[in-house]
Amino acid sequence: LPAQVAFTPYAPEPGSTCRLREYYDQTAQMCCSKCSPGQHAKVFCTKTSDTVCDSCEDSTYTQLWNWVPECLSCGSRCSSDQVETQACTREQNRICTCRPGWYCALSKQEGCRLCAPLRKCRPGFGVARPGTETSDVVCKPCAPGTFSNTTSSTDICRPHQICNVVAIPGNASMDAVCTSTSPTRSMAPGAVHLPQPVSTRSQHTQPTPEPSTAPSTSFLLPMGPSPPAEGSTGD
């Protein structure tokens, strides 16, 4: 004969546990129904009556099957440096993430406490590691034979084009310039971007030629979008 199905509330067999989506109520000493996500326990069960559930009020939620007396409060509205990627509903908390071009510099238990704008790599340097939702951009000097002429949080160093006849040699922040005859092959048809979760846009510049092919920590600054390495006050 099949075992009889017990309806909540019921007293569990000694040594056994309550079934899925049930909990053991210590006061009633019975297995009782949990409330579904989006609800909470309005009235706890007794020996003769099951849990009475009610919907979460506005701006509150429960994400799991539960028997909490009150729903959890949704987090405060997203601050100006963040965007809401998940709305507050009866079944889930609001999730805020840093807006495009920013990353979470200081996190908290759930979400981000403070966002900061991503760093960019200056001409002569390319992105070694792109920014993510929780980490800043890492830059590296462009190796000999490669260049970056942008101030960007996505552009990597790319190879100089190879010329039949070189008019101006390339350096770390400028592509080689070929004579009017076309190059044997162009190794750098366009800026190369690293994929990354934060949407970014690079700015291209026309820097003046530099004397060296690889940057040092004191390389000449191109005109265009690169402020000086010094803390200039423009006096």
Partner: antibody
Framework: EVQLVESGGGLVQPGGSLRLSCAAS????????ISWVRQAPGKGLEWVAY????????DYATWVNGRFTISLDNSKNTLYLQMNSLRAEDTAVYYC??????????????????WGQGTLVTVSS | DIQMTQSPSSLSASVGDRVTITCRAS??????LAWYQQKPGKAPKLLIY???DLASGVPSRFSGSGSGTDFTLTISSLQPEDFATYYC????????????FGGGTKVEIK
């Protein structure tokens, strides 16, 4: 030479308006986040507003309360601060300031490595 | 809103002295802190960023330390050109921010 030059300051009556300009040479504002920072006479530095042109985002100190607007004219490579409903307590030297370009190849918008010379705004009747 | 509190507000020192200025953040800001020097009638100048990194062209007698909420700017041997006002700044200027800068510390000649 890389520099920022502010202009547009002067004497204005309470409740009046003023538009400050910050012209850049040697850098392209469209690539950089840039702020306005002010300093009342004999007082400390106070951040006012920030614009990050790449992403079209602007931020203001909470006390601004919608009275000021930061904007950028890319064609002129000039930053503006439109100030309305001015009060006596807005009297200050206003600086534009851009991020820090380190010798290790970073441009970091979090810190102010490049400053203009400042322009004085006096709000008085 | 993160509050930045500097101390002392002013100090007197002599050339050659070791000078220490402190800055306290109202909440943990890890190492996102900068120090500036400002002389009368001039714009501020960045000295230290990321709490301890020396900005380009800044003399090595300036150093920064600390993380979390407590930070220090040290001038190992004060020079005549170092008499100025010094400010700390946290790196999070957004619409939640007011006191991005500390109140300043004026270093005067004793």
């Amino acid at each position: 030479e890389v520099q920022l030059v502010e202009s547009g300051g002067g004497l204005v009556q309470p409740g009046g308006s003023l538009r400050l300009s910050c012209a850049a040479s040697g850098i392209d504002f469209s690539s950089y986040g840039i702020s306005w920072v002010r300093q009342a006479p004999g007082k400390g530095l106070e951040w006012v507003a920030y614009i990050y042109p790449d992403y079209g985002s602007t931020d203001y100190a909470t006390w601004v309360n919608g009275r000021f607007t930061i904007s950028l004219d890319n064609s002129k490579n000039t930053l503006y601060l439109q100030m309305n409903s001015l009060r006596a307590e807005d009297t200050a030297v206003y600086y534009c300031a851009s991020g820090y370009a380190s010798s290790s190849g970073y441009y970091d918008p979090k810190y102010f490595g490049l400053w203009g010379q400042g322009t004085l705004v006096t709000v008085s009747s | 809103d993160i509050q930045m509190t500097q101390s002392p507000s002013s100090l007197s020192a002599s050339v050659g002295d070791r000078v220490t200025i402190t800055c306290r953040a109202s909440e943990d800001i890890e190492s996102y802190l900068a120090w500036y020097q400002q002389k009368p009638g001039k714009a501020p100048k960045l000295l230290i960023y990321d709490a301890s990194d020396l900005a380009s062209g800044v003399p090595s007698r300036f150093s920064g330390s600390g993380s979390g909420t407590d930070f220090t700017l040290t001038i190992s041997s004060l020079q005549p050109e170092d008499f100025a006002t010094y400010y700390c700044q946290h790196g999070f200027y957004t619409s939640r921010s007011d006191s991005v800068f500390g109140g300043g510390t004026k270093v005067e000649i004793k």
